[in-house]
């Protein structure tokens, strides 16, 4: 199973690194529903 | 007014495919994870998985990752879930979320 | 899988008193950044479901402050304070710690 991983900013995921950002500076709607910004 | 809008309910025979739409109205859909769940009929709430619009990077439940596949045309400010190989058990009301802002929900009924 | 179960499923409440529901998960949700990611959300009748409170214990945009979250690593907590007719509806927790789960729902009606 793919697993996060916050403490690194990246996870394994078919075989290759993809950023993680639903770390803690992440400011692309990481976490589901919560507001970011401002209306774009 | 921002919001994010659906397309409409699908009823499809077990094996096909649907795929759901999500146009973002007065909001970039490019900028922000588009991130899509489900609800099946009174059940719970199940995460499928997100897009990063921006470069096409996804990421899935494992449980769909063999019959999904989440696209975007950011030319349309839209997002697409496709699934595939479909079974009873997936109906229910799709779900996008990106940023704040909910699409309204989407029926897909798996019926012979 | 983390799973997240939730008590009770379903929750009988009178308006201006105070009603709370718990949320266990299978894993501690704190992560040694000392973020614990655990999330609530409601889904009122008929509607999409809206985000409460995020990472444990913050308030989302426009979230009425008689709602509050706490808790340890895998025990959690949401507390209404003074519950309003418009609280009524399904609520779940959540984690993304590792990909994202949510908890079965507890559903929450008037007396």
């Known amino acids: 199973d793919a697993e996060f991983r916050h403490d690194s900013g990246y996870e394994v995921h078919h075989q290759k690194l993809v950023f993680f950002a639903e770390d803690v500076g992440s400011n692309k709607g990481a976490i589901i529903g919560l507001m970011v910004g401002g209306v774009v | 007014q921002v919001q994010l809008v659906q397309s409409g309910a699908e009823v499809k025979k077990p094996g096909a495919s649907v795929k759901v739409s999500c146009k973002g109205s007065?909001?970039?859909?490019?900028?922000?994870?588009v991130h899509w769940l489900r609800q099946a009929p009174g059940k719970g709430l199940e995460w499928i998985g997100r897009?990063?619009?921006?470069?096409?990077?996804?990421i899935y439940t494992p449980k769909f990752q063999d019959r999904v596949t989440l696209t975007e045309d950011t030319s349309t400010d839209t997002a697409y879930m496709e699934l595939s190989s479909l079974r009873s058990e997936d109906t229910a009301v799709y779900y996008c979320?990106?940023?704040?802002?909910w699409g309204q929900g989407t029926l897909v009924t798996v019926s012979s | 899988d983390i799973v997240m179960t939730q008590s009770p499923l379903s929750l009988p409440v009178t308006p201006g008193e105070p009603a709370s529901i718990s949320c266990r998960s299978s894993?501690?949700?704190?992560?040694?950044?000392?973020?614990?990611?655990l999330y609530w959300y409601l889904q009122k009748p008929g509607q999409s479901p809206q985000l409460l409170i995020y990472?444990?214990?913050n308030l989302a945009s426009g979230v009425p402050d008689r709602f509050s979250s706490s808790g340890s690593g895998t025990d959690f907590t949401l507390k209404i304070s003074r519950v309003e007719a418009e609280d009524v509806g399904v609520y779940y927790c959540?984690?993304?710690?590792?990909?994202?789960?949510f908890g079965q729902g507890t559903k929450v009606e008037i007396k």
């Open positions: 897009i990063d619009p921006e470069n096409g990077e996804t």
């Open positions: 007065g909001f970039n859909i490019k900028v922000y994870y």
């Open positions: 990472q444990m214990s």
């Open positions: 894993k501690s949700l704190l992560h040694r950044n000392g973020i614990t990611y």
């Open positions: 979320v990106s940023s704040g802002y």
């Open positions: 959540a984690q993304n710690l590792e990909l994202w789960t």
